[in-house]
Amino acid sequence: EEELQMIQPEKLLLVTVGKTATLHCTVTSLLPVGPVLWFRGVGPGRELIYNQKEGHFPRVTTVSDLTKRNNMDFSIRISSITPADVGTYYCVKFRKGSPENVEFKSGPGTEMALGAKPS
């Protein structure tokens, strides 16, 4: 089995208030089975940004069709960026578990920061 890796290619993403930001994340394996979630921050206080299996995230859309059985692209777009959105975003793979899924591997994170306003 190829060991799963979480790839977040950008360490830093400069964004503009009011625009849409794209956060990239790809995986190198579909196994073990389990969902991919996006968080801002780390530790117990981290904020859930997107959960592929449930929830309502009105500002978040996926770049790829996650219903494809061979999908390895879990990149997301966040619309209408505000200063409150800055922080470091992590895509995290969970493996199935009972009663709760278990965190399996995290990407290295992408820091979202505000860039200069266009003149």
Partner: antibody
Framework: DVQLVESGGGVVRPGESLRLSCAAS????????MSWVRQAPGKGLEWLAG????????YYIDSVKGRFTISRDNSKNSLYLQMNSLTAEDTAVYYC???????????WGLGTLVTVSS | ALTQPASVSANPGETVKITCSGG??????YGWYQQKSPGSAPVTVI????KRPSDIPSRFSGSASGSAATLTITGVRVEDEAVYFC???????????FGAGTTLTVL
Amino acid sequence: DVQLVESGGGVVRPGESLRLSCAASGFTFSSYAMSWVRQAPGKGLEWLAGISAGGSDTYYIDSVKGRFTISRDNSKNSLYLQMNSLTAEDTAVYYCARETWNHLFDYWGLGTLVTVSS
Amino acid sequence: ALTQPASVSANPGETVKITCSGGDYYSTYYGWYQQKSPGSAPVTVIHSDDKRPSDIPSRFSGSASGSAATLTITGVRVEDEAVYFCGAYDGRTYINTFGAGTTLTVL
């Protein structure tokens, strides 16, 4: 309420074709992968084919690959199964089913009966 | 292939367990589907190993470990008489499979 209603079943002769339809309502059809499952008389359930939400990716069991084609029209909230070169072994009730995020099934249609007989 | 017992029986109020083996925990999710008569629409009672749809009574529960899944009905009722199919999705092959079905008789 989620509703899936199949149609298009009937009696056909071996070698003929049939196109099944599944009309979906009560949910955002374009956000869900869908599948077709059949049940032959006195037998168990058999998954046949699945299709991604956008319709670009399709998956089949080996025994129907090249003979059956799954497709969808998200503008019509409809799922289809084109069945060619039918044989008596294709006689069954055909169900459409909505997939969960991990490709199991949460809602099923009532089914449509296909009989292949000479 | 998924293997499940052909039949199980129980008295009302008893606990029933139906097992399904043949999948790989690393790559497989399981579901359980109830069919009350042949040719009638199946009803999903468990998906994602242990997730119960909101309209399914709490006496139905599911679990998975190793290469097997288990459907448990705690306090079985006469109306639970049906054939129960286990199903699996394999993330290696992208294929869904079903067991042959278990007929539950409530005495």
